[in-house]
Interface confidence: low
Amino acid sequence: ILGGREAEAHARPYMASVQVNGEHLCGGVLVAEQWVLSAAHCLEDAADGKVQVLLGAHSLSQPEPSKRLYDVLRAVPHPDSRPDTIDHDLLLLQLSEKATLGPAVRPLPWQRVDRDVEPGTLCDVAGWGIVSHAGRRPDRLQHVLLPVLDRATCNRRTHHDGAITQRMMCAESNRRDSCKGDSGGPLVCGGVLEGVVTSGSRVCGNRKKPGIYTRVASYAAWIDSVLA
């Protein structure tokens, strides 16, 4: 997270760290007792790695009573996700067992009504992604509030030049932005999950390259079918 601040510890009990071989790779969001939603591209080249999900964490390194690392039973990328585009960039991870719920571990309601969030709405994005252009990684969860940007502006030739589909949304990126390592994490508007940070190699913190988020409401049928 660029231009953000440390989050209040355990105030986002839905927040997950998707890890490969014990290292944080991407964010994720607990959407059901046994399911974490993340971004499909996150597991690039992880076929030989051990994928796990950390729940109940604020610090990645320090012991915390609520922290628990879960093995992954199944990884389900959206069937139309592709290596060379950010379209359909969603991944569902089935935990090896139901998460032990409590004040620091709780699923987040996700948006099912397929309607765009009003431009200008302030939404919260959190993650353990880099906090500087030099690539410094935080140990403790960071967050930032970002205004939603209208799709027409986001699709300007000077911005993302038509790449933003109806199934994506944008947020402003003027020095405050999600960045590498935040992919798969939640964009929360009014206490509801609206978007998932896409995992393209976009430049961060540049106002002409707004943050791109996959709209979960657009994938309600797929999410329901996998969770069923």
Partner: antibody, heavy 120, light 112 residues
Amino acid sequence: EVQLVESGGGLVQPKGSLKLSCAASGFSFNTYAMNWVRQAPGKGLEWVARIRSKSNNYATYYADSVKDRFTIFRDDSESMLYLQMNNLKTEDTAMYYCVRHGYYWYFDVWGTGTTVTVSS
Amino acid sequence: DVLMTQNPLSLPVSLGDQASISCRSSQSIVHSNGNTYLEWYLQKPGQSPNLLIYNVFNRFSGVPDRFSGSGSGTDFTLKISRVEAEDLGVYYCFQGSHVPYTFGSGTKLEIK
């Protein structure tokens, strides 16, 4: 356009050596694991070797039939994949395909292949 | 090594028919990371193979929805709901969960 183009095939005598090359273009070669897959004339597909990306220490894996004879390696700066084949046997005669390893699947982009014939 | 056994070796069908191809692995092909790397490829005459299905049941981009994959553990099936002329060729199952990775022997789908 994502493309893989193999070269280096030909006729070689048993116990001889050959180096196959694969030129990749249209994608970030250095972030992908890569494979060689072969197909003997009129036969099925056989996986030969795999090499992972730099972030995975260029780890390599081989089929038992080629272990200790074949070496897979890559040059990320040139977007090239190679297969050094030594001590060739007649049963190595096949079409050799260079194949990209995608995210959740193994072989998402295939080259057109290069033919290796091992015969005296 | 994991042996992948495909049945039948040859499958004569009429256009518009349903086709079903079976693939059985000699041991479980669930990877240690939880994924089941079971895939289906189609090789049309004179061409390189193409990926159809990955992770048992996920259709690859651009693959028509008449193709579907199913199964778990050691038994897997590829179904084509209505065979079209462009579907003819040799179908291979493949496991990428355990080194050495292995293909099935292939099933030739041909017109009756």
